[in-house]
Amino acid sequence: LTCLGGFASPGPVPPSTALRELIEELVNITQNQKAPLCNGSMVWSINLTAGMYCAALESLINVSGCSAIEKTQRMLSGFCPHKVSAGQFSSLHVRDTKIEVAQFVKDLLLHLKKLFREGQFN
């Protein structure tokens, strides 16, 4: 989590700040949504438990050509300790359930806001 700020950042970003920024990006996506997000692309649903950042990234990384979620993908990679590539799946995916990216983002946002409120940043 220490390098989430990227090159523009003067130093390490506290986990709470990184999570707040991810939440704010997801809020932007949900609020600025006019046409169906990512043309209504479907992604694997995930269990919102430990390891969910990597699982979320593994789901979203399979959506290509959707600029609206590119920043989210980059931010999630900062929370995931290992490199994630398209086609990768963890046990946290609910492999029989696909949902629209818009619903995925909404569910993730709700969960992350509660984690922030409870002080769970990692």
Epitope: S16, T17, L48, H111, K113, K114, R117
Partner: antibody, heavy 120, light 112 residues
Framework: EVQLVESGGGLVQPGGSLRLSCAAS????????IHWVRQAPGKGLEWVAR????????KYDPKFQGRFTISADNAKNSLYLQMNSLRAEDTAVYYC?????????????WGQGTLVTVSS | DIQMTQSPSSLSASVGDRVTITCRSS???????????LEWYQQKPGKAPKLLIY???NRFSGVPSRFSGSGSGTDFTLTISSLQPEDFATYYC?????????FGGGTKVEIK
């Protein structure tokens, strides 16, 4: 319109049990936290418990843990407070309240309260 | 548990007066996420509480500008700049940073 309506209060003998209900409308309880707060006659407010209906993450004031149980029924969009081994000092108006839905910073809506009287 | 101590417990004031209520927490109520979840609620007899101020100094929507909150660390203040007839009520501070969440004992504002 957001609304919280408590019910289930009444007169109960010491040692008895009571189940309070809080019916929510105008929002989905899974999107926020719901709390129970009580107020003894002529006294101040006292936070009792909180539930996250999305995952049943529950927190209590330790003084109520073991006797009181908070729960949610997402299908009915309702919350409950099961109170056991009631004592005279549990006599109070019981309110349910929700945390606002953006960052859960505060209680923005409260029910009207339901009075619980514990007496023989 | 964090104790929230309000003072005074009651006060008598006249319409137009400036009223200050203080709330002291027994330890810091800064949450691990950096926020300070200190709120002020107003309650009238037989009614549910109503939010006035959240996160120390933010006025809730619809709350008149005569209500303001300030403070940091463990010391917090609710100020009513010019008391109005509808402001006679009981005021509670509340900390929502650390479980168990706790209210102050209340301050009853009465007509002089």
């Amino acid at each position: 319109e957001v609304q919280l309506v408590e019910s289930g209060g009444g007169l109960v003998q010491p040692g008895g049990s009571l189940r309070l209900s809080c019916a929510a409308s105008g929002f989905n309880i899974k999107d926020t936290y719901i709390h129970w707060v009580r107020q003894a006659p002529g006294k101040g407010l006292e936070w009792v418990a909180r539930i996250d209906p999305a995952n049943d993450n529950i927190k209590y004031d330790p003084k109520f843990q073991g006797r009181f149980t908070i729960s949610a029924d997402n299908a009915k969009n309702s919350l409950y407070l099961q109170m056991n081994s009631l004592r005279a000092e549990d006599t109070a108006v019981y309110y349910c309240a929700r945390s606002e839905e953006n960052w859960y910073d505060f209680f923005d809506y409260w029910g009207q309260g339901t009075l619980v009287t514990v007496s023989s | 548990d964090i104790q929230m101590t309000q003072s005074p417990s009651s006060l008598s004031a006249s319409v137009g007066d400036r009223v200050t209520i203080t709330c002291r927490s027994s330890q810091s109520i800064v949450h691990s996420n950096g926020n300070t979840y200190l709120e002020w609620y107003q309650q009238k007899p037989g009614k549910a509480p109503k939010l006035l101020i959240y996160k120390v100094s933010n006025r809730f929507s619809g709350v008149p500008s005569r209500f303001s909150g300030s403070g940091s660390g463990t010391d917090f203040t609710l100020t009513i700049s010019s008391l109005q007839p509808e402001d006679f009520a009981t005021y509670y501070c509340f900390q929502g940073s650390h479980i168990p969440y706790t209210f102050g004992g209340g301050t009853k504002v009465e007509i002089k």
